[in-house]
């Protein structure tokens, strides 16, 4: 019995519903009374959802899963996972038994977009060319961990003196803080790009430093 699942991971946004596709080819005369369907976590073998003896046996996974009962007879054994959480990420095995059995695993990749970065400077007033400042780029509640890039106004990458930290909250979402230390020129723009590698989503923030001497009251920051 051949069981088919997508080769590529299923990508789901945190808080949305995901469908883990799984299908099989029922033989002529197949009835649901013959079907034994098990969804389980591939690594831990924890039961997620099952169908046996012609009946949906229900969710064993925080009541957030459902089958597509009207489609089972056609060989659609897909699983709906509701309100996806970071902790759901991983591999799910679909095990189908009729007379023979087949099993296959589908990967769930969870993602959450990063917020538009906020930019802060320290110090943020009485600045002059030649001063060393730290520019902090902060972006929140994304998943998985971000890639952070800095560049100047001409698009030249700034790689030296960058320190990036990422901290997960209780939901597993990451807050990213990246600090760039630079020596000020007469003027300049410094941009931070926070990229979600799964969603290929870029969040941009920049700050432009102008004037001589330069002062940065809070309302001069460009967000």
């Amino acid at each position: 019995l051949e069981v088919q699942v997508p080769e590529d991971p299923v990508v789901a946004l945190v808080g949305t519903d995901a469908t883990l596709c799984c299908s099989f080819s029922p033989e002529p005369g197949f009835s649901l009374a013959q079907l034994n369907l098990i969804w389980q976590l591939t690594d831990t073998k924890q039961l997620v959802h099952s169908f046996a003896e012609g009946q949906d046996q229900g969710s064993a996974y925080a009541n957030r899963t459902a089958l597509f009962p009207d489609l089972l007879a056609q060989g659609n054994a897909s699983l709906r996972l509701q309100r996806v959480r970071v902790a759901d990420e991983g591999s799910f095995t679909c095990f189908v038994s009729i007379r023979d059995f087949g099993s296959a695993a589908v990967s769930l990749q969870v993602a959450a977009p990063y917020s538009k970065p906020s930019m802060t400077l320290e110090p943020n007033k009485d600045l002059r060319p030649g001063d060393t400042v730290t520019i902090t780029c902060s972006s929140y509640r994304g998943y998985p961990e971000a890639e952070v890039f800095w560049q100047d106004g001409q698009g030249v990458p700034l790689t030296g003196n960058v320190t990036t930290s990422q901290m997960a909250n209780e939901q597993g979402l990451f807050d990213v803080h990246s600090v760039l230390r630079v020596v000020l020129g007469a003027n300049g723009t410094y941009s931070c790009l926070v990229r979600n590698p799964v969603l290929q989503q870029d969040a941009h923030g920049s700050v432009t430093i102008t004037g001589q001497p330069m002062t940065f009251p809070h309302h001069h920051h460009h967000h």
């Epitope: 019995l1 051949e2 069981v3 088919q4 699942v5 034994n36 098990i38 389980q40 591939t42 073998k45 046996a52 591999s91 095995t93 095990f95 038994s97 023979d100 059995f101 087949g102 099993s103 296959a104 695993a105 589908v106």
Partner: antibody, heavy 120, light 108 residues
Framework: EVQLLESGGGLVQPGGSLRLSCAAS????????MNWVRQAPGKGLEWVSG????????YYADSVQGRFTISRDNSKNTLYLQMNSLRAEDTAVYYC?????????????WGQGTLVTVSS | EIVLTQSPGTLSLSPGERATLSCRAS???????LAWYQQKPGQAPSLLIY???SRATGIPDRFSGSGSGTDFTLTISSLEPEDFAVFYC?????????FGGGTKVEIK
Amino acid sequence: EVQLLESGGGLVQPGGSLRLSCAASGFTFSSYAMNWVRQAPGKGLEWVSGISGSGGSTYYADSVQGRFTISRDNSKNTLYLQMNSLRAEDTAVYYCAKARSGYDYFFDYWGQGTLVTVSS
Amino acid sequence: EIVLTQSPGTLSLSPGERATLSCRASQRISSSFLAWYQQKPGQAPSLLIYGASSRATGIPDRFSGSGSGTDFTLTISSLEPEDFAVFYCQQYSNSPLTFGGGTKVEIK
């Protein structure tokens, strides 16, 4: 400690019958799929049959379908293989093998095997 | 059914050498549902690797598995005297479950 002990092998004539048993201990028997795997003299491994933990689902290799019946008695922690209409090509060492879980049919524990010889 | 072809049939090596065993499937094995076993003369097989790359309990780290889809490899990084045996791959994605024909690793 997981232990699997096969018994019931022996010499039988073509067309005859044998019943193999496998006594299991050291694990929760009813939670695991169980299997029979055989090995003809000097040959490789061949899966014969498998059964789910509850006994509700059974699976067979094409070469034994309709002739062999796998069953289990979870109250006795025992696996069985009823072999009918035996043929010379069924001659092999028969191993009882425990599946890693209820639905992962690879084998983390094996018995030492019992020899079945089909010959006139 | 899924046919597994192992190569080479025999591998003649010395202790301390690296052994590379191949297992090729006739069709894609979903999600690396492939296991490797070692069998010594007069003994039952014993599980080495499952999930194509996960070592079974108590298996030394000189044994490693890799591969996906249709091509899988068992590597023994440095052969110990007790490693010489016959090695079998097995797919557990579909019934009927199938084994490869085996690779004998013998002392050169």
